[in-house]
C-alpha cells in the first residue's frame, strides 16, 4: 500500500479468482485512544473499533472510503483504490490502446517545434468519476523539471455504439535548448482513477521523435502565362523554430484530382515554391517535414485548382 | 525519404553537400544496422544514448545560430580549444566562432572516424560476418573532413590484444551509429546555417 | 472453490458452427478477463481469444479471427466460445480459463470438424 | 507459430535432476514473466510456475523456474514416475498481450 495523496491510498492487489489479497492497517489520524468506530462509505454498519482498522483487501468491494467516528464526529478519513496486476502486469482498464505507432500505446504525444513545448493526449470510453494526472520529467534517474497543465477533456466522438472521449495536457520543459542534442529522454506518468480503480500509464520519448510541424501557411498559387502551369508558394508555420536556416524544413507538394483513385503527382522541395501542373478540378497540396531529422508529416495546407 | 531533394549549387557553401551525402549515408547505415540486427538491442528505445564527444567538443554550443545566443538554456558554456583554420571558410572575415564551430565539427569527425575503423576491425574478424561498416559512410566522413581541411593531430586507431566480444560490438555500434546520426543532423543544420548567413 | 465447467463440443461438418459454453462458479466471474485455449489430438497448446471482465476489448489469435467470436454474460456467469466456417484444423479439446497469475482451467471440451 | 522453443523430449531415472528449457526473444521473456504447467493424458493443464520462480501452494518443492535473459528453464529435482508428462511454458509478448504464448511442449520420460 502506497499514498497517492493525502488519505488517498493505493492497494497493490494480484488479481486473479480466490486470490487472498492484501492485509491493511488503517490508522484514525486522531489523539482520541477509546470510542473509535469505523465506517464504510455511506454505510452506517460499524467495521470495527479501536484506533486502528484492519482488513483484508481483496476486491472493489472491499474499496472505498473508511471513516473513523467518535460519537457521531468524524475523525479522519482513508480512500482505498485498488491498482489490479494481472498476470505481473498491470491493468489497463481505463484508456483505450491506440495502436499507433504501435500496439500497447496508451499516451500519444507530438511537439510543433524544438521548444521544448509538447502536447499528449490519451482515449477513453468512460465519462463519469474520472481524473487524471500528469507528471513529467527529462530522464528518471536524475530528472530535469517539465511542467504540465491539468488534463483536459479536448473531443468526443462517436464511435460505432460508443462514445470516446479524448483527454489533452500540454507539457513545457523548463530549460529547453531548441539545438540542443536530447540524450534523456522525455518522460510522461499519467495517473487515472476511475471510481475505485487505480493505474498508471508512461510514455518516454524525444522531442526529435515527437516532433509534427503545423502546415505550410500562406499557400498560395500564381499562373504562370500561356501554360497550364502554376507556381505554388507558401511560407513556414508561424510554430517552427527558428532560424529556418537552421531548422529546416523539407516540402512535399501534392496534385490530387477530385476523385480520390486518380494518379497523385507528388513533388519534394526544400524551397519554399514549386511550379506544377494544375488540372482542372484538382487542389494542390503542401505538407512540411524536418528537412534532417525525418520524424512526422505536417497534416496537408490545400488550395483548390480554379 | 522517397524521392530525392535536388543537389545544392556548386557555388554554395563547399561544406553543405558534403554533410547532405554524410547524413545520407549515416542514416543508412543506420537502418541497415537495425534490419540486420534485428535480435540485438539496437532501437533508439533500447540504446543507452551516449555520446562520445561529451567533454572533449562542444559543436552544439560552439555552432549556435545567433538568434539562439540569447537563450540562456543554451549558454551551457564549456571551453574547449580548438585549431583555427579551414578551407570551409568562406571568406576572411569569418569570426572566430565560426572558426571553432568547424574546427569543433572537425574534431568529432575525427573520433567518429577512429571509432568506426576500430570497430570495422573487430566486426571483420566476427566469423558469423554479420554486419560490416559501409565504406561509403567512412568515405563521406573523409570527404567532409577535408573539405573541413583542420590541420590536427592524428589519433591513432586504437588496437585491442583482447578477443572481441562480437555481441558487446554490434551493441556498441548501434550506440555510436544512433549519436552519430545525431551529430550528423547538427552538423547539416549547421552548414545550412552558415550556408544562408 | 473456483469452478468452470464447459459444454457444447461435439462432432460437425466442415463449414458449419458450433456454441461452446463455460459456467463459471465459486468467484466474482464479472471482475476478471477470461482466455479460451485449444490443443490438437497429439499437439501443443495454441491460444484462442481472450475477453475483458467487462466484455469491453476482445483477442483473437490470426488464425481464428473473423471466424470465432468470444462473449460472456456476467448475469449468467458464462463465457461462450461462437465457432463458424469451421475447419478440420479446428478439431482440438477446447479448454476456458481465467486470467491471472494463479489460473483455473475448465475440464475440456472435444470439438471434431469431419466431413 | 509457435515462438518460445523448447526440446520436444527430455528423460531421465528417478531422483536426477532433469531441466527443460524455453526460448524466446526480447519483446517475450525478455520483457515478460513465465508460467510453466504441467499437462497429464487426458487432463487439462496444471500449474506448476508463475512469475518466473513462483510455486502455488500444492506444488512439490522439486519443481522450480528462473529466467535470464530471453531464456527461462524449469527444474525437476529429484523426479519420480508420476513426475512423466507433457510440460508448456507460457509467456506474453509485449506488442501482443494479453494473447497467451505457448511454448511448443516437451514430453519428459521416467526410465526404468
Known amino acids: 500500500i502506497w499514498e497517492l495523496k493525502k488519505d488517498v491510498y493505493v492497494v497493490e492487489l494480484d488479481w486473479y479468482p480466490d486470490a487472498p489479497g492484501e492485509m491493511v492497517v488503517l490508522t484514525c489520524d486522531t489523539p482520541e485512544e477509546d470510542g473509535i468506530t469505523w465506517t464504510l462509505d455511506q454505510s452506517s454498519e460499524v467495521l470495527g473499533s479501536g484506533k486502528t482498522l484492519t482488513i483484508q483487501v481483496k476486491e472493489f468491494g472491499d474499496a472505498g472510503q473508511y471513516t473513523c467516528h467518535k460519537g457521531g464526529e468524524v475523525l479522519s478519513h482513508s480512500l482505498l483504490l485498488l491498482h489490479k496486476k494481472e498476470d505481473g502486469i498491470w491493468s489497463t482498464d481505463i484508456l483505450k490502446d491506440q495502436k499507433e505507432p504501435k500496439n500497447k500505446t496508451f499516451l500519444r504525444c507530438e511537439a510543433k517545434n524544438y521548444s521544448g513545448r509538447f502536447t499528449c493526449w490519451w482515449l477513453t470510453t468512460i465519462s463519469t468519476d474520472l481524473t487524471f494526472s500528469v507528471k513529467s520529467s527529462r530522464g528518471s534517474s536524475d530528472p530535469q523539471g517539465v511542467t504540465c497543465g491539468a488534463a483536459t477533456l479536448s473531443a468526443e466522438r462517436v464511435r460505432g455504439d460508443n462514445k470516446e472521449y479524448e483527454y489533452s495536457v500540454e507539457c513545457q520543459e523548463d530549460s529547453a535548448c531548441p539545438a540542443a542534442e536530447e540524450s534523456l529522454p522525455i518522460e510522461v506518468m499519467v495517473d487515472a482513477v476511475h471510481k475505485l480503480k487505480y493505474e498508471n500509464y508512461t510514455s518516454s520519448f524525444f522531442i526529435r521523435d515527437i516532433i509534427k510541424p503545423d502546415p505550410p501557411k500562406n499557400l498560395q498559387l500564381k499562373p504562370l502565362k500561356n501554360s497550364r502551369q502554376v507556381e505554388v508558394s507558401w511560407e513556414y508555420p508561424d510554430t517552427w523554430s527558428t532560424p529556418h536556416s537552421y531548422f529546416s524544413l523539407t516540402f512535399c507538394v501534392q496534385v490530387q484530382g477530385k476523385s480520390k483513385r486518380e494518379k497523385k503527382d507528388r513533388v519534394f522541395t526544400d524551397k519554399t515554391s514549386a511550379t506544377v501542373i494544375c488540372r482542372k478540378n484538382a487542389s494542390i497540396s503542401v505538407r512540411a517535414q524536418d528537412r534532417y531529422y525525418s520524424s512526422s508529416w505536417s497534416e496537408w495546407a490545400s488550395v483548390p485548382c480554379s | 525519404r522517397n524521392l530525392p531533394v535536388a543537389t545544392p549549387d556548386p557555388g554554395m557553401f563547399p561544406c553543405l553537400h558534403h554533410s547532405q551525402n554524410l547524413l545520407r549515408a549515416v542514416s543508412n547505415m543506420l537502418q541497415k544496422a537495425r534490419q540486420t540486427l534485428e535480435f540485438y538491442p539496437c532501437t533508439s528505445e533500447e540504446i543507452d544514448h551516449e555520446d562520445i564527444t561529451k567533454d572533449k567538443t562542444s559543436t552544439v554550443e560552439a555552432c549556435l545560430p545567433l538568434e539562439l545566443t540569447k537563450n540562456e538554456s543554451c549558454l551551457n558554456s564549456r571551453e574547449t580549444s580548438f585549431i583555427t583554420n579551414g578551407s570551409c571558410l568562406a571568406s576572411r572575415k569569418t569570426s572566430f566562432m565560426m572558426a571553432l564551430c568547424l574546427s569543433s565539427i572537425y574534431e568529432d569527425l575525427k573520433m567518429y572516424q577512429v571509432e568506426f575503423k576500430t570497430m570495422n576491425a573487430k566486426l571483420l574478424m566476427d566469423p558469423k560476418r554479420q554486419i560490416f561498416l559501409d565504406q561509403n559512410m567512412l568515405a563521406v566522413i573523409d570527404e567532409l573532413m577535408q573539405a573541413l581541411n583542420f590541420n590536427s593531430e592524428t589519433v591513432p586507431q586504437k588496437s585491442s590484444l583482447e578477443e572481441p566480444d562480437f555481441y558487446k560490438t554490434k551493441i556498441k555500434l548501434c550506440i555510436l551509429l544512433h549519436a552519430f546520426r545525431i551529430r550528423a543532423v547538427t552538423i547539416d543544420r549547421v552548414m545550412s546555417y552558415l550556408n544562408a548567413s | 472453490q473456483v469452478q468452470l465447467v464447459q459444454s457444447g463440443g461435439g462432432v460437425v461438418q466442415p463449414g458449419r458452427s458450433l456454441r461452446l459454453s463455460c459456467a463459471a462458479s465459486?468467484?466474482?466471474?464479472?471482475?476478471?478477463?477470461m482466455h479460451w485455449v485449444r490443443q490438437a489430438p497429439g499437439k501443443g497448446l495454441e491460444w484462442v481469444a481472450f475477453?475483458?471482465?467487462?466484455?469491453?476489448?476482445?483477442y483473437y489469435a490470426d488464425s481464428v479471427k473473423g471466424r470465432f467470436t468470444i462473449s460472456r454474460d456476467n448475469s449468467k456467469n458464462t463465457l461462450y466460445l461462437q465457432m463458424k466456417s469451421l475447419r478440420a484444423e479446428d478439431t482440438a479439446v477446447y479448454y476456458c480459463?481465467?486470467?491471472?497469475?494463479?489460473?483455473?482451467w475448465g475440464q475440456g471440451t472435444m470439438v471434431t470438424v469431419s466431413s | 507459430s509457435y515462438v518460445l522453443t523448447q526440446p520436444p523430449s527430455v528423460s531421465g531415472t528417478p531422483g536426477q535432476r532433469v531441466t527443460i528449457s524455453c526460448s524466446g526473444g526480447?519483446?517475450?521473456?525478455?520483457?515478460?514473466?513465465v508460467k510453466w504447467y504441467q499437462q497429464l493424458p487426458g487432463t487439462a493443464p496444471k500449474l506448476l510456475i508463475y512469475?518466473?520462480?513462483q510455486r502455488p501452494s500444492g506444488v512439490p518443492d522439486r519443481f522450480s523456474g528462473s529466467k535470464s535473459g530471453t531464456s527461462a528453464s524449469l527444474a525437476i529435482t529429484g523426479v519420480q514416475a508420476e513426475d512423466e508428462a507433457d510440460y508448456y511454458c507460457?509467456?506474453?509478448?509485449?506488442?501482443?498481450?494479453?494473447?497467451?504464448?505457448f511454448g511448443t511442449g516437451t514430453k519428459v520420460t521416467v526410465l526404468g
Open positions: 480459463k481465467t486470467h491471472g497469475s494463479h489460473d483455473n
Open positions: 512469475g518466473n520462480d
Open positions: 507460457q509467456s506474453y509478448d509485449r506488442g501482443t498481450h494479453p494473447a497467451l504464448l
Open positions: 465459486g468467484f466474482t466471474f464479472s471482475s476478471y478477463g
Open positions: 475477453i475483458r471482465y467487462d466484455g469491453s476489448n476482445k
Open positions: 526480447r519483446s517475450n521473456i525478455g520483457s515478460n514473466r
